[in-house]
């Protein structure tokens, strides 16, 4: 550890005195202290000498000697008082900047230790300290305001009692800064803007922070706009607002607008897009296919996306047939706004009935005209099957009618024994009918097909089954010949034909 001569913790001298402070260490040593006048510094071997031959009150302070090469960083210090009867204070700062809840040291150094008993801290012009100001004093360092608050940002003076009268120091401005959690908070309104050429528009960029020291600007396509700033303070936050008013927009006003705010913690920015159009527009679209197929009994939501400016003047869902003149219930239609110019309209069709197949149209209107988007809804049905025995051109024929949607495929099976449904073990023969005759095929209806199986002789201890299937399901009908005629077995009921 370096050694200072004179080897006293503090030294008291009069103005004009010669002061020599010598520091000796094992290696090179350095003096550190408040920058002040009249000092000269010189080296003498392994010692460093700080001296003045004309000490003034401004040399009052703590001088520390360190050994830069010492890994333990040892140091020695001496405090010098230059007691000037006219100058009880040496003030080392014009201002002190700290963050809230830090201790704020106001560096009023007492030039005469004898005066310590009569010191106090006041605000300028003799005003008392604010309530709850907790402070302490050190003659070496000055006044410390503990856990300083933003509201204590004031101009202070140090007061000393000299010969019965108070002598004030020059003032020190204390700036207590709010602890800033991050860059300023931003809002840019609107998030998106569309206007027809010639209309008026307004874009508002605002930023707020707990600290007043922040900048905000609005830029258009990377060009900073010169807009007067409005400032406000509420809810313990400083607010700065930039409002861009355009009386008659033109195409050059279109583009990207960015609101940017920055402080010591960094930068925040948010952007919006401004579209200028020649005239009103109304666009309808759907992410869904306009041709929909749904199984009967299931539900469906029809969704239409609307992009429009100006806003819609009217909209509705209409059922265009063909089954009935019913109209969708209003409670099944709802609208959600994605943003100012885009909306989604949904028609909910729960537990679809056969009579609800057909065309559904969404109509919307704005000053640009009206538009419609039509969905075609076809219901899917599992096949229904029936078989009859008949003679065609003198030949015995089994006739199978299958009805469903999509169009069913038909397969004939011949199996041994009498059964409601042929299983694999019983099957004697299988015929696929790749091209059954289409009996009816109308839009939004079931497709009915017919398949013929010519049988020369009906085997009495056998079953003939017609099976039909499509993507929804399957159906079958079993035909059992009996001596009295033919016996048919639908899947879940008995029918007798003579």
């Amino acid at each position: 550890i370096p050694v200072i001569e004179p080897s006293v913790p503090e030294l008291v001298v009069k103005p004009g005195a010669t002061v020599t402070l010598r520091c000796v260490g094992n290696g090179s040593v350095e003096w550190d202290g408040p920058p002040s006048p009249h000092w000269t510094l010189y080296s003498d071997g392994s010692s460093s000498i700080l001296s003045t031959n004309n000490a003034t009150f401004q040399n009052t302070g703590t001088y520390r000697c360190t050994e830069p090469g010492d890994p333990l960083g040892g140091s020695a210090a001496i405090h010098l008082y230059v007691k000037d009867p006219a100058r009880p204070w040496n003030v080392l700062a014009q201002e002190v900047v700290v963050f809230e809840d830090q201790d704020a040291l106001l560096p009023c150094l007492l030039t005469d230790p004898v005066l310590e008993a009569g010191v106090s801290l006041v605000r300028v012009r003799g005003r008392p300290l604010m309530r709850h100001t907790n402070y302490s004093f050190s003659p070496w360092h000055g006044f410390t305001i503990h856990r300083a608050k933003f509201i204590q940002s004031q101009d202070y003076q140090c007061s000393a009692l000299m010969g019965g009268r108070k002598v004030m120091s020059i003032s020190i401005r204390l700036k207590v800064q709010k602890v800033i959690p991050g860059p300023p908070a931003l809002t840019l309104v609107p998030a998106e803007l569309v206007r027809i050429r010639g209309e008026a528009a307004q874009i508002v960029c605002s930023a707020s922070s707990v600290d007043v020291n922040f900048d905000v600007f609005l830029q258009h396509n990377n060009t900073k706009l010169a807009i007067p700033q409005q400032s406000d303070f509420h809810n313990n936050r400083y607010q700065k607002v930039l409002t861009l008013n355009l009386d008659q927009v033109d195409f050059q006003h279109a583009g990207n607008y960015s609101c940017v705010a920055s402080n010591v913690q960094g930068k925040h920015s948010t952007s919006m897009f401004f579209r200028v159009v020649e005239s009103a527009y109304l666009n309808l679209s759907s992410e869904q296919n306009l041709i929909q197929e749904v199984t009967v009994g299931e539900g469906l939501n029809l969704k239409v996306m609307v992009e429009a400016y100006p806003g819609l003047q009217g909209f509705n869902w209409t059922y265009l047939g063909p089954f009935s003149d019913h109209q969708p219930e209003p409670k099944l239609a709802n609208a959600t706004t994605k943003d100012t110019y885009r909306h989604t309209f949904t028609l909910s069709l729960p537990r679809l009935k056969p009579s609800e197949a057909g065309r559904y149209s969404f109509l919307a209107r704005n000053p640009g005209g009206w538009r419609a988007l039509t969905f075609e809804l076809t219901l899917r049905y599992p096949p229904e099957v029936s078989v009859i025995w008949t003679f065609i051109n003198g030949s015995g024929t089994l006739l199978c009618a299958a009805s469903g949607y999509p169009q069913p495929n038909v397969t004939w099976l011949q199996c041994s024994g009498h059964t409601d449904r042929c299983d694999e073990a019983q099957v004697l023969q299988v015929w696929d009918d790749p091209y059954p005759e289409v009996l009816s095929q109308e839009p939004f209806h079931k497709v009915t097909v017919q398949s013929l199986l010519t049988v020369e002789t009906l085997e009495h201890n056998q079953t003939y089954e017609c099976r039909a299937h499509n993507s929804v399901g399957s159906g079958s009908w079993a035909f059992i010949p009996i001596s009295a005629g033919a016996h048919t077995h639908p899947p879940d009921e008995f029918l007798f034909t003579p």
């Epitope: 003096w31 550190d32 510094l41 001088y63 201002e95």
Partner: antibody, heavy 117, light 110 residues
Framework: QVQLQESGPGLVKPSETLSLTCTVS????????WSWIRQPAGKGLEWIGR???????YNNPSLKSRVTMSVDTSKNQFSLKLSSVTAADTAVYYC???????????WGQGTMVTVSS | QSVLTQPPSASGTPGQRVTISCSGS????????VNWFQQLPGTAPKLLIY???QRPSGVPDRFSGSKSGTSASLAISGLQSEDEADYYC???????????FGGGTKLTVL
């Protein structure tokens, strides 16, 4: 070996605030006073002000009302803000260590700041 | 306008001795010690002389400083081409309560 490094934007628009930071490496900011000095192109040096670890600041009276300084011990940095800048503030800005009896014994390499629209 | 006055330029040939003057007042040089800085082209200033006549380690003894009254001077003996630089004097100013600089002297080695 203590070293200083200035950083900040090289271009500032008139009437805006110039912000610079000086990072101290190879030693602690906790000892010594630290100063800012500037030098307009082809001209002499001008002392702006000094700051101490406690946040004590003393500025050149000619700039005092426009200057704000702060210190961040956790980052070993001190900073300068100069508000309402004009073209006259265009200069190379230096940070330096300010020692008693040995003013400005260590300097940063300087950063050029141009004030222009 | 700088507080301390220096000649704008000085010159000398290699090996010569050159002196640069710095004039102030009682509030600066008259009552405070003087520092000198060397600024090589395109670089930051470097402390050359402190406390009137003290050299930091690494500064050649060709450089010396002196002070008398309200004036100070920097002498460079055995001038070398690498000494071509700007030289600034500085001193504490009691009225400013901080340092003031001279306007700088451009030294040319012919």
């Amino acid at each position: 070996q203590v070293q200083l490094q200035e950083s900040g934007p090289g271009l500032v628009k008139p009437s805006e605030t110039l912000s610079l930071t000086c990072t101290v490496s190879g030693g602690s900011i906790s000892s010594y006073y630290w100063s800012w000095i500037r030098q307009p192109a082809g001209k002499g040096l001008e002392w702006i002000g000094r700051i101490y670890i406690s946040g004590s600041i003393y500025n050149n009276p000619s700039l005092k009302s426009r200057v704000t300084m702060s210190v961040d011990t956790s980052k070993n940095q001190f900073s300068l803000k100069l508000s309402s800048v004009t073209a006259a503030d265009t200069a190379v800005y230096y940070c330096a260590r300010d020692r008693v009896g040995m003013t400005f014994d260590i300097w940063g390499q300087g950063t050029m700041v141009t004030v222009s629209s | 306008q700088s507080v301390l006055t220096q000649p704008p330029s000085a010159s000398g040939t290699p090996g010569q001795r050159v002196t640069i003057s710095c004039s102030g007042s009682s509030s600066n040089i008259g009552s405070n010690s003087v520092n000198w800085f060397q600024q090589l082209p395109g670089t930051a200033p470097k402390l050359l002389i402190y406390s009137n006549n003290q050299r930091p380690s690494g500064v050649p003894d060709r450089f010396s400083g002196s002070k008398s009254g309200t004036s100070a001077s920097l002498a460079i003996s055995g001038l070398q081409s690498e000494d071509e630089a700007d030289y600034y004097c500085a001193a504490w100013d009691d009225s400013l309560n901080g340092p003031v600089f001279g306007g700088g002297t451009k030294l040319t080695v012919l």
